[in-house]
Interface confidence: low
């Protein structure tokens, strides 16, 4: 499955768990494999394109979410989701344009 599809689906499900169920553990279980995939690096041109378009913002969001694990400051997760939501919107717009 293409990275942008995995991230789009993953962010959608993770946001449902976070905002809908307040299930932070479940949210991390979905997002961390996606970040691990991103961290391993792109292996195709499409993955390279995704990494260049969204990698920096997703890494910044991940740093906020990891900070939450040590700080327990809910505002850190809110900040992470500000960025995740922004990326989700950009991926959604890109999908809509190309389909």
């Amino acid at each position: 499955i293409l990275w942008h599809e995995q991230w789009h689906e993953g962010l959608e499900e993770a946001s449902r768990l976070y905002f809908g169920d307040r299930n932070v553990k479940g949210m991390f279980e979905i997002l961390e494999p996606l970040h691990a995939m991103l961290e391993r690096g792109p292996q195709t041109l499409k993955e390279t394109s995704f990494s260049q378009a969204y990698g920096r913002e997703l890494t910044e969001a991940y740093e906020w979410s990891q900070r939450y694990k040590t700080s327990a400051v809910v505002m850190d997760l809110d900040r992470a989701w500000d960025i995740y939501y922004h990326v989700f919107q950009k991926i959604s717009r890109h999908h809509h344009h190309h389909h």
Epitope: Y18, F19, S71, A72, V73, V74, M75, D78, R79, W81, D82, I83, Y85, H86
Partner: antibody
Framework: EVQLVESGGGLVQPGGSLRLSCAAS????????IHWVRQAPGKGLEWVAY????????SYADSVKGRFTISADTSKNTAYLQMNSLRAEDTAVYYC?????????????????WGQGTLVTVSS | DIQMTQSPSSLSASVGDRVTITCRAS??????VAWYQQKPGKAPKLLIY???SLYSGVPSRFSGSRSGTDFTLTISSLQPEDFATYYC?????????FGQGTKVEIK
Amino acid sequence: EVQLVESGGGLVQPGGSLRLSCAASGFNVSSSYIHWVRQAPGKGLEWVAYIYPYSGYTSYADSVKGRFTISADTSKNTAYLQMNSLRAEDTAVYYCARNYGGYPRKYAGAFDYWGQGTLVTVSS
Amino acid sequence: DIQMTQSPSSLSASVGDRVTITCRASQSVSSAVAWYQQKPGKAPKLLIYSASSLYSGVPSRFSGSRSGTDFTLTISSLQPEDFATYYCQQSYGSLITFGQGTKVEIK
């Protein structure tokens, strides 16, 4: 122009209730943290609570937890502070303040806009 | 809770003086510290955010710095309109806290 206007203060007896309103204009409350901060006469600033309407998250100072409830109505662009079981030590000017919560983050937890304050007096 | 210990509680100074106010956090707060100025009967005004960033419209004589858990607000040359009370605030913890305040009075 960004503006915050508090209302609802007044004189109330110990054990009574009061609801404060914070009407926002010039920005969308759903993309900001809205805080309540109070200042007892001649004293310093004390943070009371915040709400992040985008996610519904709230946080309270220990001194008001269980007695005060913060909420927001995004359709009215207004935040509220419901104060129950009021005590003499809750007497203060209550300010609402904004911390921008959108993307990108701006002022890193600082309150860039404040209302003029509303006085709450708890006395028999 | 994270405590912000502010000193001094008050100081007397003259126009043109360099004034320094300090806040010490009881634990690490990263750089999530802001400084405010408050005049009697008025709401506080933001001066400094993120420990050292000057808020828009604030005169450049105000500056902030950080050294570990110590945070400093400096007024390089005190002006008549600067006589007021100053507060630090941390927003790193889930419970936000202010310093006790420093009243800057005319000598």
